[in-house]
Amino acid sequence: FERTRSLQDPCSNCPAGTFCDNNRNQICSPCPPNSFSSAGGQRTCDICRQCKGVFRTRKECSSTSNAECDCTPGFHCLGAGCSMCEQDCKQGQELTKKGCKDCCFGTFNDQKRGICRPWTNCSLDGKSVLVNGTKERDVVCGPSPADLSPGASSVTPPAPAREPGHSPQ
């Protein structure tokens, strides 16, 4: 059964950064190097996280708090507390099982991580393409001709030399 921590449990007096050392009449001993306790009353200290391989140390382990890791250049964190490091790709690419691949025509990725996403379909909002999309950038939608009052100056996009939205690969 779980006892309420009280006078009957002398270990409850051991603060964070220590453990209750039963081998030494339940006195509070400091956590040994490479370990920590973030709460009081612990019978053992926790093993510090080690930032190795593609992980690098962002914050050293202390007696009361765990180490924090981030990723070496060319990688980015994934998951809670940077539990994984994933390879960066260039803008205009996405990471697949076979490595970094260029975004397919009609999709883009403006970051070094994540997946390629489809260009915005301007016509769904009744708008026209103002700036063509590329692998790295989404299209920019402009007002539809009907939105322009007579005599208003219209921004005329440069005549596409290729099919709309396409850019040199």
Epitope: F1, S38, A39, G41, Q42, T44, D46
Partner: antibody, heavy 120, light 111 residues
Amino acid sequence: EVQLVQSGAEVKKPGSSVKVSCKASGYTFTSYGLNWVRQAPGQGLEWMGYINPGSGYTKYNEKFEGRVTITADKSTSTAYMELSSLRSEDTAVYYCARWGLGRNWNFAVWGQGTLVTVSS
Amino acid sequence: DIVMTQSPDSLAVSLGERATINCRASESVDSYGNTFMHWYQQKPGQPPKLLIYRASNLESGVPDRFSGSGSGTDFTLTISSLQAEDVAVYYCQQSNEDPLTFGQGTKLEIK
């Protein structure tokens, strides 16, 4: 008496997940880390990771990172180990084991073990 | 990872005789004045049982015919006078470095 009582045997299909429980009694559940160690048939012992039920802190063997999740329910003094994407090589007896005293990081109290069989 | 290698893989000893099991770590398991090496006994159909902690300390309730010695990378578990109930598999374990690792086990039988 300090005791760890585990859930019963499981038979699972490849690709599925299994969740094994470990109910602790006879000590202050939140004061000691609870580990999971597995043993394939006729093989040695392999540490999978542990949880500090007081803080919720977990530490996993990198070999299992991403496939194993260890949790604890303080209200019932029960720890759980979930292993996903099971394959035939995961057929083993899974033990929960409590840390010993102090700074030793050894396994002083063991559950009776749970046999997990992965077979199509 | 620290690799633990036990020798021999199996051992047959007469009742009342001394049994010696060795364990070698691929790197030192000494740290800050402590030796993070432990020994376990496992009988068929049962979970392991802690015998020796930190190389040479006898766990409570374990008969004093069991003893442990060593430091750094080389360790020994000794049973001074083998009893029938000592037939089991014995494992060493290091806790100096994450991940915690075990030896492959040594099977002890009666000759």
